[in-house]
């Protein structure tokens, strides 16, 4: 299953091959599924896209779906690092406003302490 | 609360035309991909169809053809539409949420997550 | 197609029992493999996906393990609510494809 170890995509993998490239990765590595129409091959990440992040789990670590709403990027499930445009960052949540008390810092779109 | 009730199942003839609705709720369902699972009396759980939440659509060979599936995000409703029914098409009929094939999402979407309690279709002459 | 075996087919089991369930694809499915109950005339649950990840609200007697080829579903100690049939899928490639089912009865 390693023959194809020398290609690229197979970089990390624990297990590979020439159709759907990496299907397990190294420990520290997150698993990653590219779906093309009907086909998919698997990469082994250090870092997991934008809009996901890594999980760690038993068998394999891998990148999961960022869900906090109006969120782009994530460092786990339920704390948001970069919101998308138009919102403020605050306590890895998003919003449309700072709450009172926090004012839109523009240039990082983080909500920081203090008066509007 | 999520729910998917499904209708629209009944007795139809070999050859005939069938279609099936799914109404879920409690879910952003724009946001989601669904799906459609059958299972024959007696019998385990066969994949029918997935639909991403932009609208993109996938079968198995057995129904790519014969079997549309659609999706209305503002009434919240997921639809099959079948045609050229067979015997070997008479299931429960199940709409699910998640099981997108275009999309990887690394998590619960890539199964499927809820169901609804399914609706019979029976093909006899 | 991706076969997915399931083993045993059926089972007696008791309360309060330790079951395990085998699920085997027939090529690597990395850790794409979710696990669903169903009890009669109900539709499925969704137990575990991405191999070893429960569900929310899903008990923590149930657990997953494997990659590759090769999956099991543990039930640490088996409850009266229990009793079902079990199944597991590939969401790794499509068609998605189920395993045949495993019934989980009382001895």
């Known amino acids: 299953r390693a023959s194809y170890v020398s290609n690229p995509i197979c970089k990390g993998c624990l297990s590979c091959s020439k159709d759907n490239g990496c299907s397990r990765c190294q420990q520290k590595l997150f698993f990653f599924l590219r779906r093309e129409g009907m086909r998919q091959y698997g990469e082994c990440l250090h870092s997991c896209p934008s809009g996901y992040y890594g999980h760690r789990a038993p068998d394999m670590n891998r990148c999961a779906r960022c869900r906090i709403e109006n969120c782009d990027s994530c460092f786990s499930k339920d704390f948001c690092t970069k919101c998308k445009v138009g919102f403020y960052l605050h306590r890895g949540r998003c919003f449309d406003e700072c709450p009172d008390g926090f004012a839109p810092l523009e240039e990082t779109m983080e909500c920081v302490e203090g008066c509007e | 609360e999520v729910q998917l009730v499904e209708s629209g199942g009944g007795l139809v003839k070999p050859g005939g035309s069938l279609r099936l609705s799914c109404a879920a709720s409690?879910?952003?369902?724009?946001?989601?991909?669904m799906s459609w699972v059958r299972q024959a009396p007696g019998k385990g759980l066969e994949w029918v169809s997935s639909?991403?939440?932009?609208?993109?659509?996938y079968y198995p060979d057995s129904v790519k053809g014969r079997f549309t599936i659609s999706r209305d995000n503002a009434k919240n409703s997921l639809y099959l539409q079948m045609n050229s029914l067979r015997a070997e098409d008479t299931a429960v009929y199940y709409c699910?949420?998640?099981?997108?094939?275009?999309?990887?999402?690394?998590?619960?979407?890539?199964?499927?997550?809820?169901w609804g309690q399914g609706t019979t279709v029976t093909v006899s002459s | 197609d991706i076969q997915m075996t399931q083993s045993p087919s059926s089972l007696s089991a008791s309360v309060g029992d330790r079951v395990t369930i085998t699920c085997k694809a027939s090529?690597?499915?990395?850790?794409?493999v979710a696990w669903y109950q169903q009890k009669p005339g109900k539709a499925p649950k969704l137990l575990i996906y991405?191999?070893?990840t429960r569900h929310t609200g899903v008990p923590s007697r149930f657990s997953g393990s494997g990659s590759g080829t090769d999956f099991t579903l543990t039930i640490s100690s088996l409850q009266p609510e229990d009793f079902a049939t079990y199944y597991c899928?590939?969401?790794?490639?499509?068609?998605?494809?189920f395993g045949q089912g495993t019934k989980v009865e009382i001895k």
């Open positions: 699910a949420r998640g099981g997108d094939p275009g999309v990887y999402n690394g998590d619960y979407e890539d199964a499927m997550d809820y």
């Open positions: 409690g879910f952003t369902f724009s946001s989601y991909a």
């Open positions: 639909i991403s939440s932009g609208g993109s659509t």
């Open positions: 090529q690597d499915v990395s850790s794409a």
């Open positions: 991405w191999a070893s």
């Open positions: 899928q590939q969401h790794y490639s499509t068609p998605w494809t």
